[in-house]
Amino acid sequence: AITEAREEAKPYPLFPGPLPGSLQTDHTSLLSLPHTSGYQPALMFSPTQPGRPYTGNVAIPRVTSAGSKLLPPLAFKHTVGHIILSEHKDVKFNCSISVPNIYQDTTISWWKDGKELLGAHHAITQFYPDDEVTAIIASFSITSVQRSDNGSYICKMKINNEEIVSDPIYIEVQGLPHFTKQPESMNVTRNTAFNLTCQAVGPPEPVNIFWVQNSSRVNEQPEKSPSVLTVPGLTEMAVFSCEAHNDKGLTVSKGVQINIKAIPSPPTEVSIHNSTAHSILISWVPGFDGYSPFRNCSVQVKEVDPLSNGSVMIFNTSASPHMYQIKQLQALANYSIGVSCMNEIGWSAVSPWILASTTEGAPSVAPLNVTVFLNESRDNVDIRWMKPLTKRQAGELVGYRISHVWQSAGISKELLEEVGQNNSRAQISVQVHNATCTVRIAAVTKGGVGPFSDPVKIFIPAHGWVDHAPSSTPAPGNADPVLII
């Protein structure tokens, strides 16, 4: 049978009287053992049956050195089998064996849970020689025991290549409950049930759990660990913790906040980063996410114009990055812009609206009636056109861009000329003779360059052969005439 020893001092139990389903062990009185060292442990044990030989793993010497008589089998004496003590206390336990003096160099090693204990352990071996035998007492002491010291300790001794093993000494370190699983913070949907888990272990067991919600106990009676609390739903933030109780006292878990998911707060600080004629780049600062990740955002755009029908354009975009380029806008127009973002619960309110404007656009039509003819006497090409009918949004005409391409015997060269807005004619120098010159013209505003007119081609002959007939585009500007000389 296992001999059990307990500490004499025990804190007042949490639950007076016997606990259901458990036995309360009486404290056994401790037996004293004289110590040769100055070390005074918290617990002292003597062998309970000092003379009884251990019959498990023994070394049986065949004969003495004289070869005359058999020696008795060697075995460790029985000692206390189970030591129960509180965390942070000191403990000392020992193995003892009597070894005939014929054996030299006997060493005792300590093992815990099958592994040899080496290094900085407080193991002391003392020898008490007599005429025929030497009594060996191997002591093992642990100061300020921790839970990790729990386990089965044995002594081993090697003699004549044989191993003698002691009975195990079980060390049980008891303390306050230790959490192996604590409730975790969560974000939950309003009025929706969810679970929290709490698990704590001893020793000593059992460990009982109380759940606490906003400082009030949820369960009036203890629940065995592990415990799962099904919270029936919340309408507002709550703080939960669990208390773990055992005979040593109480440990309280961390308090965790359970938040209620809600629609996000509206974005703030919507700002304009860049405006063009047909697009506006905006950014915003997201509002509070309502304890639920943003899914996407919606950019709402209203044209600020008494004549507009007040319709709202909606552009959906991802929640990140907090930036969006609004496209397909009218040039030189005023807009009111707001942003709203959504999470799994729903859409936020719209951010404060901000005003933004697009810039002037480029012209949308090309100059009309482009005419090109050769002025051989001056060695240049005359170009004439009609001013295009531009919309207000295109802004003020600032000039024209003329593209002329010279092609001759597989060589092609494009040149660009800029002329002022008051002109409707231009002259360009002949670059190459015996070549085709292709002319296109585009109107220019601050908003950019409009589309080029359809190309007009004119052949530039070798010197001395002249025809003043012009090349031109008809008014719609969609023909591609070529004048052949």
Partner: antibody, heavy 118, light 106 residues
């Protein structure tokens, strides 16, 4: 199935004592507290307190201390309400109820009518 | 102690009508439980923790509320629903009941 069965009606004289029993079945008795609720004739429900069946510790509501005692016999899964020095105003139906999480009284006894009359 | 005030004290309605019963707390309450009691019978659990139906309770019963204001709604009264209804708070000791609302046939 879970059941709470209470003792029968009692007719007592003022100054006497009465002991009402509440026998539980269909669940582990020591896992749930037992609450006591009073209902005077034509009146509403009045919470008297509860007893922790795990520790035996009673908790009494204001107005139910002194003459009122909650007790247990866990070996027979029974809770008791004892009222001493009975008064006419103690005439009421007394209910026991099983206390679940969040002090929710999920199963009730059928009630015991205690009549105090000279 | 948290005082629970139920209103109205009596509600006179016809079968098929909607009943709305109120329970106001003198201070903040985390959860409200509701019980139904018929003459000569023990109270019967109806709603657990504000909005959860007790087992065997039909879906025409529903509970809502938070803070100090809680409501029990019966969407369409059946003849067997005419009874007295009590609220009970979970937040702090002592556990208290409201004074009750009697739902009677008009």
């Amino acid at each position: 199935q879970v059941q709470l069965v209470q003792s029968g009606s009692e007719l007592k004289k003022p100054g006497a004592s009465v002991k009402v029993s509440c026998k539980a079945s269909g669940y582990t008795f020591t896992n749930y507290g037992v609450h006591w609720v009073r209902q005077a004739p034509g009146q509403g429900l009045e919470w008297m307190g509860w007893i922790n069946t795990y520790t035996g510790e009673p908790t009494y509501a204001q107005g139910f201390t002194g003459r009122f005692v909650f007790s247990l016999d866990t070996s027979v899964s029974t809770a008791y309400l004892q009222i001493s020095s009975l008064k006419a105003e103690d005439t009421a139906v007394y209910y026991c109820a099983r206390g679940n999480r969040y002090a929710y009284m999920d199963y009730w006894g059928q009630g015991t009518l205690v009549t105090v009359s000279s | 102690e948290i005082v629970l005030t139920q209103s109205p004290a009596t509600l006179s309605l016809s079968p098929g009508e909607r009943a709305t019963l109120s329970c106001r707390a003198s201070s903040h309450v985390s959860y409200m439980h509701w019980y139904q009691q018929k003459p000569g019978q023990a109270p019967r659990p109806l709603i657990y923790a504000t909005s959860n139906l007790a087992s065997g309770i039909p879906a025409r019963f529903s509970g809502s509320g938070s803070g100090t204001s809680y409501t029990l709604t019966i969407s369409s009264l059946e003849p067997e629903d005419f009874a007295v209804y009590y609220c009970q708070q979970w937040s702090s000791n002592p556990r208290t009941f409201g004074g009750g609302t009697k739902v009677e046939i008009k």
